[in-house]
Interface confidence: low
Amino acid sequence: MAGPLRAPLLLLAILAVALAVSPAAGSSPGKPPRLVGGPMDASVEEEGVRRALDFAVGEYNKASNDMYHSRALQVVRARKQIVAGVNYFLDVELGRTTCTKTQPNLDNCPFHDQPHLKRKAFCSFQIYAVPWQGTMTLSKSTCQDA
């Protein structure tokens, strides 16, 4: 039997699938039908976007051979796509902080301001989330020094 938390998640899952297969959902008279399965702009304030961002930056830090943690300076663009789960597409500017990787990754670490240690990177992340399973995967990650 679905518990108090699982029931709404199950409904969300059913809704997501229904939206994904509905060919003209969200269309209005005089406008071409918009495929709900296509990417749409998302707000950085959304909890799902925040979680996806934290996950992607965490993976970036794990993979980088940098002495320091990086964190988001700004999210340039956020989009999401409802599929069997949710694809998040995030364009993010990252900055190197003064926190080393031997320290916990603190969200409020200040950014380096010394010219020889300052570093920015621009990254495009694609994160696949299945909220009702609590899983996230970094499907794509491309970064370049900014």
């Epitope: 051979n65 940098d66 002495m67 010219p115 020889h116 240690l117 300052k118 570093r119």
Partner: nanobody, 114 residues
Amino acid sequence: DVQLQASGGGLVQPGGSLRLSCAVSGTNFRLNDMAWYRQPPEKRRELVALITGGGNTSYADSVKDRFTISRDNIQRTLYLQMNSLKPEDTAVYYCTTQRSGRQYWGKGTHVTVS
């Protein structure tokens, strides 16, 4: 250009000690944060210890109280004193520094604890 040359690795028994050195040229050593990384076989490279230009140190939990990072600004050399070595410390050890947004790596020295 920045050059780093690590040395001092070798084969040692569990519980033994080694001291790694890293000679640095081509940068203002005194101002640079320096670090030792290691890459165990088949694993990701990981940060072991870091020392700032001001001499503050920071260690990975796995080596705390066993390893000591230090620097000699006159000799322009970075050190890693490794005591109470364990088989899981087996890895290639690299010294590294950052300058102008770039990270520079030494060639690496092999440490085998067996």
